[in-house]
């Protein structure tokens, strides 16, 4: 067996996907393994083809550590083994996400509606952009909530957590006090579980223009947007 | 490698002003918070004031607001400590301490890195 | 200001102990707690953030936990490395605050 083309080294960044690709010829066609760290690769998926006696194999990671990835390219001629190996390591870069200066402040949420649905002591998010950060997003909550009135008491407290966890984020405090958004999953449990028919109704509104002001819009997240907690567990906060 | 090197520290009358500085290497000193700790002879640890990556955000101790003001150059990569108004309560070890999200973006991680300090005396 | 409150003072502890140093916020601070260790003429270095995540090149011999008010720092299996002054910190709300530190020593 020879490699043809040997897997790359990368510098990436934590959370980012990477394919190394092994290329290995041989008679009979060889098969590729892989090996992570001196182990069989536990994660990550694997894709092969062959063509001309040549194959292909292309490993595609998800990067969350460091690690050393060999290409073991082994065939057989009657009972002699021929084994070629590459290696490619996977370095993570500094991880350094420029800090957004965000306009707000994070503060014990001290408002009404949202007191049964938020965490007695957490920090929420207040955004400064409103010239009366607590005093609006009461205020957008409030109006949504009078909409829910009439949602199904399966949807109700859904969609209560849900707008009152995205109006008032979860503040992460520092230097930079920094909003955490909803985790996606949720937000999608949200939308396609226990409010789907009521979130076809909202959505077509929408497009109808049947909304007057843009305050409903705002409580409402684009659960597309939002992180993912498999792409990191603590990228989003759970409901 | 990270490294945060203080200076500036002395003796100092009563009343006097000093400037400490911090020069910073081995990050991407524009894309952090910077922080000042100070610590008296045999005591405990005092946070001083910290500064966001652009300045935006900047805060004090209430035992130093009026006194000391923070302050960075980040095409220096550089940190800096005025302080008027000297006394002996100021006496102490400075520290210049960085400090990072984690991974997500999301969490505050405080002081991951620190300097060796510069020692300040107030002292007639 | 929130004060932080840590016990004991001192601890004297053998190498293999188990050790735990506690920490109390006069008021909640949720889980935003950070650990230190401090040894005698050098900076101090961080252990454990957010309460119980531990910092990246940490022996996993040092963990953390708590949340409110209540938070502890224990150390499984205590080294020669370990005899040091521990100090908690609050990150919820400016002014941050210390503790007043735990010196572990050698019994």
């Known amino acids: 067996a020879r490699i043809l083309r040997a897997p790359e080294s990368h510098n990436v960044t934590f959370g980012s996907f990477v394919t190394l690709h092994c290329t290995a010829t041989g008679i009979p066609v060889p098969t590729i393994t892989w090996i992570e760290n001196g182990n069989a690769v536990s994660s990550g998926s694997i894709q092969e083809s062959v063509k001309d006696r040549v194959i292909d194999s292309r490993l595609q990671l998800f990067i969350t550590k460091p690690g050393l990835y060999t290409c073991i390219a082994t065939n057989k001629h009657g009972e002699k083994f021929s084994t070629a190996k590459a290696a490619a390591t996977i370095s993570i870069a500094e991880w350094s996400k420029p800090q957004k200066d965000n306009k707000g402040y994070c503060a014990q949420y001290r408002g009404e509606v949202c007191n049964a649905v938020l965490a007695k002591d957490a920090l929420v998010f207040l955004n400064t952009s409103y010239a009366d950060p607590e005093e609006a997003q009461e205020l957008l909550v409030h109006t949504a909530w009078n909409e829910l009135k009439v949602v199904s008491p399966v949807c109700r407290p859904a969609a209560e957590a849900l707008l009152c966890n995205h109006i008032f984020q979860e503040c992460s405090p520092g230097v930079v006090p920094t909003p955490i958004p909803i985790c996606r999953e949720y937000c999608l449990a949200v939308k396609e579980l226990f409010c789907a028919k009521e979130w076809l109704v909202m959505e077509e509104k929408t497009h109808r223009g049947l909304y007057r002001s843009e305050m409903h819009l705002l409580s409402v997240p684009e659960c597309s947007k939002l992180p993912s907690m498999h792409w990191d567990p603590t990228a989003c906060a759970r409901l | 490698e990270v490294q945060l090197v203080e200076s500036g520290g002395g003796l100092v009358k009563p009343g006097g002003s000093l400037r400490l500085s911090c020069a910073a290497s081995?990050?991407?000193?524009?894309?952090?918070?910077m922080n000042w700790v100070r610590q008296a002879p045999g005591k405990g640890l005092e946070w001083v004031s910290s500064?966001?990556?652009?300045?935006?955000?900047?805060y004090y101790t209430d035992s130093v607001k009026g006194r000391f003001t923070i302050s960075r150059d980040n095409a220096k990569n550089s940190l800096y400590l005025q302080m008027n108004s000297l006394s002996a309560e100021d006496t102490a070890v400075y520290y210049c301490?960085?400090?990072?999200?984690?991974?997500?973006?999301?969490?505050?991680?405080?002081?991951?890195?620190w300097g060796q300090g510069t020692l300040v005396t107030v002292s007639s | 200001d929130i004060q932080m409150t840590q016990s004991p003072s001192t601890l004297s502890a053998s190498v293999g102990d188990r050790v735990t140093i506690t920490c109390r916020a006069s008021?909640?601070?949720?889980?935003?707690l950070a650990w230190y260790q401090q040894k005698p003429g050098k900076a101090p270095k961080l252990l454990i953030y957010?309460?119980?995540s531990l910092e990246s090149g940490v022996p996993s011999r040092f963990s953390g936990s708590g949340s409110g008010t209540e938070f502890t720092l224990t150390i499984s299996s205590l080294q020669p490395d370990d005899f040091a002054t521990y100090y908690c910190?609050?990150?919820?709300?400016?002014?941050?605050?210390f503790g007043q530190g735990t010196k572990v020593e050698i019994k």
């Open positions: 301490a960085r400090d990072r999200y984690d991974r997500s973006g999301y969490y505050y991680v405080p002081f991951d890195q």
């Open positions: 081995g990050f991407t000193f524009s894309s952090y918070s």
């Open positions: 500064i966001s990556s652009s300045s935006s955000y900047i």
């Open positions: 008021q909640s601070i949720t889980s935003w």
């Open positions: 957010k309460a119980s």
């Open positions: 910190q609050q990150y919820n709300s400016f002014s941050w605050t």
